[in-house]
Interface confidence: medium
């Protein structure tokens, strides 16, 4: 066993190449120096080492940097991202959005796994908030990010960042973080003209209030039955017969299809039978 | 502090009609966000919702009950009443009174009458 | 109509546990679930609405998540007071339905 602690003669390693693949664990761990890895880490994805082999290499950083590796480091960890804990992963100051990217990139295709959900943290943090450029690269990957975010979290995203949500980032949204959405996609598209505004303010309307929808209304949007589904009731009633009419265009024949949904049901409760006659839908109060 | 009251017979003979009233008190029946329900529970057995009124007379029934429901308010009395006809032995349970409140749950409960359907 | 499923129907658990139960909704209901508390002789007693926000004066160890069909009411450490029975209820489309209940027990 003693022996076995000493790099056999010949085998010291003076790269990371190919050959290591061929190393025993214990070899490794005897062979390969710590600060080689740490200048050579950008070669370790391109060579087929085994899980065991990649705990290895790992034990040896992490001997080496116990206080948590240097972005340079983490930079070019590849595969050995899969390895990390969150507990290590909280040691680490990340800063660059290539850093980010790259890392995210090992775990493309799979759920937020813990450790890339600590990563994310780490990042925003040390950022201060969710600028652009780091919201655009996050849902790019993860669309479902924005909706993982409490409404406390969300508060810190800055208006001009809403530009790079999509539709598809706030599918899982719920009322409460569409509520701190919505004015800052307000304040964030306030200069566009009324049809290009409604497109992209449509995704975040589950979080406009009764007097936005007033206004809406009075600009010929059309607005879908999926989108007035998902408005917020106390928002949609106080609306008039002839306000949801305007605002829904020609989409307000789905009303009655969804008369027994919310926020229809509540509303149309709330409306005068003459009034609700006009539509000719048969909806009754 | 809106607090609901129910109140009716505790026994009714089979084919006869259920009627139940709940007042309401520290609020008012004709508030602009609020819907009031009947909800019932058959003895050791779960939750089952009859149906509900707005201040203006709206109502919306269980359709497995509705041919024999009437729910009707009278804001006068700062009350609302439930009449279930042609009552079985099936309709044996304790009746709540409900407020759906604007967050769309029943945040207020009355404490509940139980009702035998038995001759 | 709307079919809410819960799960377990009963368990066992020790002061201190967590304790987790789901529903499921036979149909996407959004964020419209709302749960419930039930004590023996008692009317319920409303916990969490809109899946998952808070209903005022109920303790922060009961929480909810879920969107769309599936849904998760944890209690995050049961204390003697929270053996009970509990619902879910959906208020997106009538009629409103219940689940079947979930009775939590002593072990």
């Known amino acids: 066993e003693v022996e076995k602690t000493a790099c056999p003669s010949g085998k010291k390693a003076r790269e990371i190449d190919e050959s290591l693949i061929f190393y025993k664990k214990w070899e490794l761990e005897a062979c390969v120096d710590a600060a080689l890895l740490a200048t050579q880490m950008d070669r370790v994805n391109a060579i087929p080492f085994t899980y065991e082999q990649l705990d290895v290499l790992k034990h040896k950083l992490d001997e080496l940097y116990p206080q948590g590796y240097p972005e340079s480091v983490i930079q070019h960890l590849g595969y050995l991202f899969l390895k990390m804990s969150p507990e290590d992963i909280r040691k680490w100051n990340v800063t660059s959005l290539e850093t980010l990217k790259a890392l995210l990139e090992v775990n493309k295709g799979h759920e937020m796994s813990p450790q890339v959900a600590t990563l994310i943290d780490r990042f925003v943090k040390g950022r201060g908030q969710l600028d652009k450029d780091t919201l655009d690269t996050l849902t790019a990957f993860y669309p479902g990010y924005l909706c993982s975010l409490s409404p406390e979290e969300l508060s810190s995203v800055p208006p001009s960042s809403i530009w790079a949500v999509r539709p598809q980032d706030l599918d899982t949204c719920d009322p409460r973080q569409l509520d701190v959405l919505y004015p800052k996609a307000r304040l964030a598209f306030q200069n566009m003209n009324g049809s290009e505004y409604f497109v992209k303010i449509q995704s975040f309307l589950g979080g406009a209030p009764t007097e936005d929808l007033k206004a809406l209304s009075q600009q010929n949007v059309s607005m879908d039955l999926a989108t007035f589904m998902k408005l917020r009731t106390d928002a949609v009633l106080p609306l008039t017969v002839a306000e949801v009419q305007k605002l829904l265009g020609p989409h307000v024949e789905g009303l009655k299809a969804e008369e027994r949904h919310r926020p229809v049901r509540d509303w149309i409760l709330r409306q005068r039978q003459d009034d609700l006659d006009t539509l000719g839908l048969g909806l009754q109060g | 502090q809106v607090q609901l009251q129910e109140s009716g017979p505790g026994l009714v003979k089979p084919s006869e009609t259920l009627s139940l009233t709940c007042t309401v008190s520290?609020?008012?029946?004709?508030?602009?966000?609020?819907?009031w329900s009947w909800i019932r529970q058959p003895p050791g057995k779960g939750l089952e919702w009859i149906g509900y009124?707005?201040?203006?007379?709206?109502?919306n029934y269980n359709p497995s009950l509705k041919s024999r429901v009437t729910i009707s308010v009278d804001t006068s009395k700062n009350q609302f009443s439930l009449k279930l006809s042609s009552v079985t032995a099936a309709d044996t349970a304790v009746y709540y009174c409900?407020?759906?409140?604007?967050?769309?749950?029943?945040?207020?409960w009355g404490q509940g009458t139980m009702v035998t359907v038995s001759s | 109509d709307i079919q809410m499923t819960q799960s377990p129907s009963s368990l066992s658990a020790s002061v201190g546990d967590r304790v987790t139960i789901t529903c499921r909704a036979s149909q996407s209901i959004s964020s419209y679930l709302n749960w419930y508390q039930q004590k023996p002789g008692k009317a319920p007693k409303l916990l969490i609405y809109?899946?998952?926000s808070l209903q005022s004066g109920v303790p922060s160890r009961f929480s909810g998540s879920g969107s769309g069909t599936d849904f998760t009411l944890t209690i995050s450490s049961l204390q003697p007071e929270d053996f009970a029975t509990y619902y879910c209820q959906q208020s997106y489309s009538t009629p409103l339905t219940f689940g079947g209940g979930t009775k939590v027990e002593i072990k």
């Open positions: 409900a407020r759906e409140g604007k967050n769309g749950a029943f945040d207020i």
């Open positions: 809109a899946a998952s």
């Open positions: 520290g609020g008012s029946v004709s508030s602009y966000h609020d819907l």
């Open positions: 009124i707005y201040y203006s007379g709206s109502t």
